[in-house]
Interface confidence: low
Amino acid sequence: IWELKKDVYVVELDWYPDAPGEMVVLTCDTPEEDGITWTLDQSSEVLGSGKTLTIQVKEFGDAGQYTCHKGGEVLSHSLLLLHKKEDGIWSTDILKDQKEPKNKTFLRCEAKNYSGRFTCWWLTTISTDLTFSVKSSRGSSDPQGVTCGAATLSAERVRGDNKEYEYSVECQEDSACPAAEESLPIEVMVDAVHKLKYENYTSSFFIRDIIKPDPPKNLQLKPLKNSRQVEVSWEYPDTWSTPHSYFSLTFCVQVQGKSKREKKDRVFTDKTSATVICRKNASISVRAQDRYYSSSWSEWASVPCS
Amino acid sequence: RAVPGGSSPAWTQCQQLSQKLCTLAWSAHPLVGHMDLREEGDEETTNDVPHIQCGDGCDPQGLRDNSQFCLQRIHQGLIFYEKLLGSDIFTGEPSLLPDSPVGQLHASLLGLSQLLQPEGHHWETQQIPSLSPSQPWQRLLLRFKILRSLQAFVAVAARVFAHGAATLSP
């Protein structure tokens, strides 16, 4: 058993056949010594008396809010949550496996630049009685600070018969060093509580591996005289690290006909302009990627040829 | 050429070669099925690798103040990786395919290190750890880890030379 936060405790249970469970001793937070009784949740049934209560926690029926009273007055509470290890594996029932980039990916994170700011998100089908708290650090043995905000519900989607909820959190490394080569990964830890079930999820990554620039901005076309060619120009996104002579991007320019089946013409360039042939009804799209490290491409920025 | 004690390197040549190194490092080891090598307990492998750290002066401001600290750090790393790529880890079984980019990568590391330090000048170099994996699968894993770590190192080096070529070239 360990303390998650004040008056909230997590009991780790091997969810096993005939497992004896965990013996837990609760102590009433009061100077009083006698006349103390204990109840669980909303029930008025007295579970025991005395300053301490010893219980055997085996299943969810044994978890909940234990309250000690004296003469009708509440003295203190202890909320017991369960963390299940089932068939040798800690339960991961609360969050959905996003399966990208590999199985058992519950948390996904992205950064728009090298400033040490990143966003993580996760999915669940649970709509009520759900809380999350997020902690993060750089490295685990001698952790350096990363500050995370509160997790918020960022999107709701309907998937078949189910509703899916996306939560996200923003974190910022306290002493980020954008130009350095990371040697210790960022660790992100999410505590999830659904009713009386506790689970924790972790992700470990280097910022360089989760970089995904915003799309290029101010995408413009300039027709070239007496030619079907156009000059496409764009700018670095505002959110990208500066100076651009140091934090450089590379770009992919694509000409795409109206039908998805039409052949796509692609040009790769380190410049912020390119000359391409503009076909009728086609569109021109540009996306960006770190020039020197193959992390994710940005989403496309697009303009119609006409 | 960067002569210890002060003069500038051939920024543009270094820029071109370091960008080529980035391309080679990624073609030698694309993200293989997103193999997460940090899960494989790699403390003893990559902790000894020279990293370009915050105090090494490789940020734009540090380069403007005195690029020598940073160039020395990059030189150290290039020599370190050049030795690793020429070691039993890459030359032993399972042998690399004949057209593997590792050979070119090895030669380019050497080329860039020589651009930074001509014959007769000696910056201190870091000792290469004695890594002699006993099993072919361990060697394969070690190669992946070294190449992943090299990708991060050469990315920073390429940024340094690109910025130098754009802002510090005579």
Epitope: D14, W15, Y16, P17, E59, D87, G88, T92, I94 | -
Partner: antibody, heavy 114, light 112 residues
């Protein structure tokens, strides 16, 4: 008294599907994962996958992905396994087993034959 | 996947003797929590498997103390003392340290 009662034997044609059931009684159905295991003609046991009856979440053995689909009906405390596009290789006894593998159903024999 | 190896047949034993059945795992089943995630089952002819031992050495409810489990993270042993006729059947070990859970091929126990 705790029990896992499986549906009876099935004789099915190649290419068809079959859905076998496992009804739990004597305990809180949603509190315990349900595993499914295959045993081909006196051979060893192969783990197919597991479902959490409370959330409906599943984990499959890669080998049985696309072959087996695990579902539950909480109202009747019943776990189901559907086997698709059956071939002779799928002829076997299939067991459900509660978390920890302490309790097993009696097994359902599936025979695939033209 | 973790591969579990078992010998197919144990030498026939006489009633009252002891016998050990071994099982080897391609990866350690010993977790950081100090527990070894291995089960032992007995499948008697025509019956469902019966859990004998879980967590390598803990006897399941109602299982005779003649059965005991031991081992390291990779080499595991089931010991049956004072063998009886009712112990005949196939003994399987199973790892539940990692998905997919895997079983050994089974060891058949015969009595002379």
């Amino acid at each position: 008294e705790f029990q896992l009662q499986q549906s009876g034997p099935e004789l099915v044609k190649p290419g068809a599907s079959v859905k076998i059931s496992c009804k739990a009684s004597g305990y809180s159905f949603t509190d315990h994962n349900m595993n499914w295991v295959k045993q081909s003609n006196g051979k060893s046991l192969e783990w197919i996958g597991v479902i959490n009856p409370n959330y409906g979440t599943t984990t499959y053995n890669q080998k049985f992905k696309g072959k087996a689909t695990l579902t539950v009906d909480q109202s009747s405390s019943t776990a189901y396994m559907q086997l698709n596009i059956l071939t002779s290789e799928d002829s076997a006894v299939y067991y459900c087993a509660r978390r920890g593998f302490a309790y097993w159903g009696q097994g359902t024999l599936v025979t695939v034959s033209a | 996947d973790i591969v579990i190896s078992q010998d197919e047949l144990s030498n026939p034993v006489t009633s009252g003797e002891s016998v050990s059945i071994s099982c080897r795992s391609s990866k350690s089943l010993l977790y950081k929590d100090g527990k070894t995630y291995l089960n032992w089952f007995l499948q008697r002819p025509g019956q469902s498997p019966q859990l004998l031992i879980y967590l390598m050495s803990t006897r399941a409810s109602g299982v005779s103390d003649r059965f005991s489990g031991s081992g390291s993270g990779t080499d595991l042993t089931l010991e049956i003392s004072r063998v009886k006729a009712e112990d005949v059947g196939v003994y399987y070990c199973q790892q539940i340290a990692e998905y997919p859970f895997t079983f050994g091929s089974g060891t058949k126990l015969e009595i002379k």
